[in-house]
Amino acid sequence: PKQTLPKPIIRAESTYMVPKEKQATLCCQGSYGAVEYQLHFEGSLFAVERPKPPERINGVKFHIPDMNSRKAGRYSCIYRVGELWSERSDLLDLVVTEMYDTPTLSVHPGPEVTSGEKVTFYCRLDTATSMFLLLKEGRSRDVQRSYGKVQAEFPMGPVTTAHRGSYRCFGSYNNYAWSFPSEPVKLLVTGDIENTSLAPTDPTFPDSWDTCLLTRETGLQKDLALWDHTAQN
């Protein structure tokens, strides 16, 4: 029998990239009957929430107002049932954006290419930064990193219709503080007709799957099974 509770799932509501001075919302999904959830930031306690009533709710939301570089970093959460704590969730990287300047994104040979052509994106930012990030809208977890003093290049290799979509880039002042996003560049890949149906237009920011899936029990639980989730010795 287990002596630990399942680890919770931590998510960012809407997006993990939060413009400065805006509110971030993180969700911690644990178990029905959990008494308390703790949000930890860089290993230290950051916030506590208690679901009301605990037996009807399987998680909580943590609101982080006025986002800034001091609040950007690695978050995790834990919860307890009775006095037993769960394992820690996986780490979530929360990024603050709209810091300082706006980079320029361009694509070579151009925004309209044929399937199989080699494509390179260029991200340029004149202020002091060495890391650049390229994101495809709707795929914001798939961040490509590249390094350069003022400009970085992102070679894509031979493209397919799966590469179609809007791209933005950021300059990064550290792992968790990013510039304003560039204006989007829409890559249109023609040809390769038989694969076209496999590459629908991507959703725009924020990622549609990057949401909080907290649920509320409608009926009263007939027992407190969760209290007996763990062995007593």
């Epitope: 208690r50 009301k52 049932v81 009775g82 037993l84």
Partner: antibody, heavy 117, light 107 residues
């Protein structure tokens, strides 16, 4: 079976520190929190705080936060509570208590700490 | 901090009596309440957790009830070994706090 065995009684002078140990056996030490509770003579129960031996994370009753340090040694399955700047009103029996999904399910036998000049 | 107010502070009863002890929290604790029994010179023993659940090995004459802010421990038929002090305790937030105790004495 689960056992929490505490160190013996202590007599201390005001201003001194005391460190009480609690050796756990019969379960996986790192899977459960260890709480500390005290009881002054003829009085009720007062929660001091807890430690998660797995992570070392601690949480304290604000009343004791400045004077109490909770630690745990995973290699010996032993939890410790150190109380500094002792005063006469700290005279009490100190208990270590395992925290489980059912709350405070196993208690140590208690350690009497007497503070007297 | 959540205050736990226990009543009565003491009571006298005879073997076979039905005994009821109440505990009131200063705010809703959502059934996150435990009851303990303590005999002189001994550590407390867990009787009830999550307001209504009997701990392992606790006789069925003990029962817990209540929700929100008001909770009750009932001993349906008092036995000689039940003369002791009883405490309620919440574990809804920090700090965990205990009621002041109810001493059950022989009439």
């Amino acid at each position: 079976q689960v056992q929490l065995v505490q160190s013996g009684a202590e007599v201390k002078k005001p201003g001194a520190s005391v460190k009480v140990s609690c050796k756990a056996s019969g379960y996986t030490f790192t899977s459960f929190t260890m709480h500390w509770v005290r009881q002054a003579p003829g009085q009720g129960l007062e929660w001091i705080g807890y430690i998660n031996p797995s992570s070392g994370y601690t949480e304290y009753n604000q009343k004791f936060k400045d004077r109490t340090t909770l630690t745990a040694d995973k290699s010996t399955s032993t939890a410790y509570m150190e109380l500094s700047s002792l005063r006469s009103e700290d005279t009490a029996v100190y208990y270590c208590v395992r925290g489980s999904s059912r709350g405070f399910d196993y208690w140590g036998q208690g350690t009497l700490v007497t503070v007297s000049s | 901090d959540i205050q736990m107010t226990q009543s009565p502070s003491s009571l006298s009863a005879s073997v076979g009596d039905r005994v009821t002890i109440t505990c009131r929290a200063s705010e809703n604790i959502y059934s996150n309440l435990a009851w303990f029994q303590q005999k002189p010179g001994k550590a407390p023993k867990l009787l009830v957790y999550a307001a209504t659940n009997l701990a392992d090995g606790v006789p069925s004459r003990f029962s817990g009830s209540g929700s929100g802010t008001d909770y009750t421990l009932t001993i349906s038929s008092l036995q000689p070994e039940d003369f002791a002090t009883y405490y309620c305790q919440h574990f809804w937030g920090t700090p965990r706090t205990f009621g002041g105790g109810t001493k059950v004495e022989i009439k």
